[in-house]
């Protein structure tokens, strides 16, 4: 039998920009209040199993408590909402992982080379470390035709799956996206024949 949690933390998947402030709330279910004879003032917040100081906690109403963190710098924190019930027995209500990092920088210095008769490799500078899962996508178009996207495995280069056509200009750019933002590099326009790597 699956046991329903006693309440929830919102947001459920918190991602915070490093150095900024962050507030989470824990909402207890009515049934939980009655079963354990508690209200939100009984909530104990913990980060990585250590109790959060009381001055960071606010009881909003009988079911809801909030916690505020200033200048978040740790890359990953386990945040839990717990209740003290029946003579100080601590009961876990809900837990989330709070991640912190940066939105992606605009990729710069985009360059491409063509391996004749094979494929095209493009490389770029992703900028500063984001400390978050960040997806880099190489995008390309010719006139009004969109080519397949190239998903980068390493975040600094991508080998396109198509063989570019010579003697027509294509446009190539890089998109970077994580939980904190989405950006695009400026595009470069070139005829692939001009980027052929001498064998």
């Amino acid at each position: 039998q699956l046991l329903e949690p006693c309440g929830y933390i919102y947001p459920e998947f918190p991602v915070v920009q490093r150095g900024s402030n962050f507030t989470a709330i824990c909402v207890l279910k009515e049934a939980c209040l009655q079963h354990y004879y508690v209200n939100a003032s009984y909530i104990v917040w913990k980060t990585n199993h250590a109790a959060v100081p009381r001055e960071q906690v606010t009881v909003i109403n009988r079911t809801t408590s909030s916690v505020t963190f200033t200048d978040v710098v740790l890359p990953s924190v386990q945040l839990t909402c717990n209740i003290l019930s029946f003579g100080q027995i601590e009961q876990n209500v809900y837990g989330v992982t709070m991640l912190s990092g940066f939105p992606p920088d605009k990729p710069t210095n985009l360059t491409c080379i063509v391996n004749e008769g094979k494929n095209m490799l493009c490389q770029w500078d992703p900028g500063r470390e984001t400390y978050l899962e960040t997806n880099y996508t190489l995008k390309s178009e010719w006139a009004t035709e969109k080519f397949p996207d190239c998903q980068s495995k390493h975040g600094t280069s991508c080998m396109v799956s198509y063989m570019p056509t010579y003697y027509v200009n294509i446009e190539v750019w890089v998109e970077a996206e994580n939980a904190l933002g989405k950006v695009s590099s400026e595009s470069i326009n070139f005829d692939p024949v001009d980027k052929v790597k001498p064998t």
């Epitope: 605009k106 995008k139 178009e141 006139a143 009004t144 035709e145 969109k146 446009e171 750019w173 998109e175 989405k182 950006v183 695009s184 590099s185 400026e186 595009s187 470069i188 326009n189």
Partner: nanobody
């Protein structure tokens, strides 16, 4: 004469919708990235959205993401900005701009609206 003409603005209540159009005359719109920019009274211009030449790539300002949708019909030489769930802070003159390539998103350079634009008013 080569020009872009914006239309479709008007007065709408908060929560309402409008569809703006950007039509090209004198040149083929399909060879350009199109950017929507807005400028509220007493404020600087703000990038709103862009669409690539094929229409396959779109970008939005955080303030409009999820509410606005940019699209293009290259056969009609027109780009559209569908604006839903409008808010009072969306009120501005909206302009479209053309660029031969992707300026990056969000663009670093300051937009310089040149056309007449179309006025969007959001008020109850």
């Amino acid at each position: 004469q080569v020009q872009l003409q914006e239309s479709g603005g008007g007065l709408v209540q908060p929560g309402g919708s409008l569809r703006l159009s950007c039509a090209a005359s004198g040149f083929t719109l399909s060879t350009y990235w199109i950017y929507w920019v807005r400028q509220a009274p007493g404020k600087g211009p703000e990038w709103v959205s862009t669409v690539s030449r094929s229409g396959g790539t779109t970008y939005y300002a955080d303030s409009v993401n999820g509410r606005f949708t940019i699209s293009r019909d290259n056969a009609k030489n027109t780009v559209y900005l569908q604006m839903n769930n409008l808010k009072p802070e969306d009120a501005a003159v909206y302009y479209c701009l053309a660029s031969v390539s992707n300026l990056g998103w969000p663009p670093v350079r300051a937009p310089s609206p040149t056309g007449q634009g179309t006025q969007v008013t959001v008020s109850s």
